[in-house]
């Protein structure tokens, strides 16, 4: 019996087609993805093949103005239109709190939403009961397939699930649910979830009875053969894991941002054992037509976005200096504003010992593309912020050793004075440079804000200590020459859309007046 699994993950609000790098579509003839194009390909495959499941492995939420404005209603609407069969909860589904998940998505989705390792307690337990499930048995042709969900247990540090949801260890939580499916005579089981490729492989290895793992969170690109675009494969598709009980378990992921549609064909024997598996992600490039009816619906929903981008988010009573003459040479108040917003967006008081789990921010000055003048009645709009942060990036959470941070700050000024983008703006960090010293030895003082303290204060950076830092995904990926970050990071979790982080902060503060306050000094 053959099953076709079509899968997406980490779509992050890319409802419209995008450029090849998943930013805003500029030249339509070269654009990719989007739900209208995805629908065309899904329908084509459904037409051709008998047993097709369309699955999403989480993180539909967060990433573009679509999510900022529609807050998840767009996800439910268009996933319903594409007739998804199931979705796993990702960490970003909790970005607007549990209410922001329940109302727009859980109550509106016409497909099951899954996670076996999230347990509700207290008053939330009855409120959320039945709105998401640990597993679902789906009829597919003449057979049934069990889908069991999972979500990153780091979600409380990455999003806003509140205090009434407990995120358990994935493997511990999955095993009893899979066992239950087996007792129900379900012998074909897919683990669908959002914990990253390393955990996907562990689930394949450790959870008895799981036949296939469809994952997300780590934006992993797998491919067999010559890859069709810029993404470099992390391995073959599917990635085969040998389970502890000797089975060959295919593990798949389909990069991110709706650029690819994962396509996996699985052949099962009559006892539900995987006989063979093959496939590849399908690049959704512009040669695949956008479905006109879905496209028309997108255009209808778009109208509200255009109106939103010119509305006032808040006010500034000072000039927000985002000029390259400032931000690439010295501390600039636009850099301070953005870093403060980045830290504020990551406030998660999850432990009495820590006032927060993260206190530090770094931001490449070259990523700040425009100032905002306060003389326009002080008004700040989404449109203004899009000029400051035009690249559609995210502000991510990483864990780095102090020694890596020291290297990053040396790199920040290794060729100082040439207006290059690697000069770092900061938050929760005090740095002093001596430019008279040779490159690679210019950081003379580097103090960082403590987290394990009731009264935050600045302490010298410890080379062997592991620190959490918020930074643009561009830096996490080694951009602007920060190869040491990419090579040495110990953990990397994708965060929220850059503009969304700053806009939320400005809306919260109502009036802002960031200063230049001695975060970066030259001796």
């Amino acid at each position: 019996w053959e099953l076709t699994i079509l899968h997406t993950n980490d779509v992050h609000s890319r409802l419209e087609q995008t450029s090849e790098d998943s930013s805003k579509c500029v030249n339509a003839s070269r654009c990719m993805g989007g739900v209208a194009r995805l629908f065309t390909k899904v329908q084509q495959i459904r037409r051709a093949e008998p047993n097709v499941l369309l699955l999403d492995a989480g993180d539909q939420y967060q990433g573009t103005i679509w999510f900022t404005v529609y807050k998840g209603a767009e996800v439910a609407h268009f996933m319903n239109a594409l007739r998804y069969d199931a979705m796993a909860l990702g960490n970003h589904e909790f970005d607007n709190g549990v209410e922001g998940l329940i109302e727009p998505l859980l109550k509106e989705a016409k497909f099951p939403i899954l996670s076996a390792n999230i347990k509700a307690k207290g008053p939330l337990a009855s409120q959320i009961s039945g709105l998401y499930l640990p597993y679902k048995v789906l009829p597919v042709g003449d057979e049934v397939v069990g889908i069991v969900g999972y979500t990153s247990k780091e979600t409380p540090f990455l999003s806003n699930p509140g205090t009434n949801l407990v995120f358990e260890d994935e493997i511990t939580a999955l095993q009893p649910e899979v066992d239950k499916l087996k007792t129900l005579n379900v012998n074909k089981i897919i683990a669908l979830g959002h914990s990253g490729f390393e955990m996907d492989k562990l689930i394949a290895q450790k959870v008895r009875g799981v036949d296939v793992v469809v994952g997300g969170h780590s934006n992993t690109f797998l491919y067999t053969g010559n890859p069709p675009s810029k993404e470099v494969p992390a391995g073959k598709y599917p990635f085969i894991v040998t389970s502890d009980d000797g089975r060959k378990v295919p593990v798949v992921q389909a990069y991110a941002f709706g650029k690819y549609l994962g396509y996996l064909k699985i052949e099962f024997d009559e006892r539900g054992n995987v006989i063979s598996s093959h496939g590849n992600p399908i690049l959704l490039n512009s040669s695949i037509p956008e479905d006109p009816s879905i496209k028309a619906d997108i255009n209808k929903w778009r109208i509200k976005l255009d109106n939103y981008s010119t509305q006032e988010l808040g006010k500034t009573i000072v000039y927000l200096d985002g000029s390259s003459q400032s931000c690439r040479f010295r501390e600039c108040n636009m850099g301070n504003l953005i870093c403060d917003a980045m830290i504020n967006n990551n406030l998660r008081h999850t432990d009495e010992m820590f006032w927060n789990h993260v206190s530090m921010c770094i931001l490449n000055g070259g990523g700040i593309r425009s100032p905002i003048d306060e003389r326009n009645n002080g008004t700040i709009t989404w449109e203004n912020l899009a000029a400051v942060l035009p690249f559609g990036g995210t502000f991510d959470l990483v864990q780095l050793k102090g020694s890596t941070l020291k290297k990053a700050f040396e790199h920040s000024v290794h060729r100082y004075g040439q207006s290059t983008g690697e000069f770092l703006q900061v938050g929760g960090i005090h740095v002093v440079y001596d430019l008279s010293r040779k490159p690679g030895d210019r950081v003379v003082k580097l103090d960082v804000l403590c987290t394990k303290c009731r009264v935050p204060s600045y302490d010298p950076l410890k080379m062997d200590e592991v620190y959490k830092v918020i930074l643009p995904n561009f830096l996490a990926n080694g951009g602007d020459g920060f190869q040491m970050i990419k090579d040495e990071l110990l953990r990397h979790d994708s965060g929220d859309q850059d503009i969304n982080v700053v806009s939320t902060y400005i809306s919260k503060m109502k009036v802002i007046y960031p200063a230049v306050e001695g975060r970066i000094k030259f001796s």
Partner: antibody, heavy 121, light 107 residues
Framework: QVQLVQSGAEVKKPGSSVKVSCKAS????????LSWVRQAPGQGLEWMGE????????YYNEKFKGRVTITADESTSTAYMELSSLRSEDTAVYYC??????????????WGAGTTVTVSS | DIQMTQSPSSLSASVGDRVTITCKAS??????VAWYQQKPGKAPKLLLY???YRYSGVPSRFSGSGSGTDYTLTISSLQPEDFATYYC?????????FGGGTKLEIK
């Protein structure tokens, strides 16, 4: 290399049936669609229907309302098109053509050489 | 059914000429349009797919454009081997339909 080899020319009486074969080689038969297209003498092209050999799913042009049946034999990588209740207007060259539904080429990328069917009393 | 209206039905041109053939669909076919070249006694050959994508091995003098209902095939500089009949086809909805063809003849 990809090849679609069709059966030889046929002469048929009105009211009878014809079954044309198309043997595929050089690719995975079950991973592509196969369409049948005909061309009457001096005329344009007309799509008759398609089959997806992996599933056996078939779709037909309503114009042929029940007269056409498309089948596939996975074991021999061969597709068949049977047209019944033949009339003189069915005199045409019948082509099979491959369709890559998993790729992005929206069109028929490989064609058979064609089979001439003549309907005459 | 979606009608594909191709024009002109015949065209005389010389080697080196720039030639344009148009195809109008009776409804939006969302770039799901292919163009074929057919020579007498031969099967059609795929030239362009998805309105503007050249099929592998097709010379760069062949180009396509269009969206919605209007599509164009352009041959930038006619070569002797280009004299043939050209068909457009919509691959958006079944029944897939072809244009009536454009016979390109030598002037």
């Amino acid at each position: 290399q990809v090849q679609l080899v069709q059966s030889g020319a046929e002469v048929k009486k009105p009211g009878s049936s014809v079954k044309v074969s198309c043997k595929a080689s050089g690719y995975t038969f079950t991973s592509y669609g196969l369409s049948w297209v005909r061309q009457a003498p001096g005329q344009g092209l007309e799509w008759m229907g398609e089959i997806y050999p992996g599933s056996g799913n078939t779709y037909y042009n309503e114009k042929f309302k029940g007269r056409v049946t498309i089948t596939a034999d996975e074991s021999t990588s061969t597709a068949y098109m049977e047209l019944s209740s033949l009339r003189s207007e069915d005199t045409a060259v019948y082509y099979c053509a491959r369709y890559d539904y998993l790729g992005s080429s929206y069109g028929f990328d490989y064609w058979g050489a064609g089979t001439t069917v003549t309907v005459s009393s | 059914d979606i009608q594909m209206t191709q024009s002109p039905s015949s065209l005389s041109a010389s080697v080196g000429d720039r030639v344009t053939i148009t195809c109008k669909a009776s409804q939006d076919v969302s770039t799901a349009v292919a163009w074929y070249q057919q020579k007498p006694g031969k099967a059609p050959k795929l030239l362009l797919y998805s309105a503007s994508y050249r099929y592998s091995g097709v010379p760069s003098r062949f180009s396509g454009s269009g969206s919605g209902t209007d599509y164009t095939l352009t041959i930038s500089s006619l070569q002797p081997e280009d004299f043939a009949t050209y068909y457009c086809q919509q691959h958006y909805n079944t029944p897939y339909t072809f244009g009536g063809g454009t016979k390109l003849e030598i002037k």
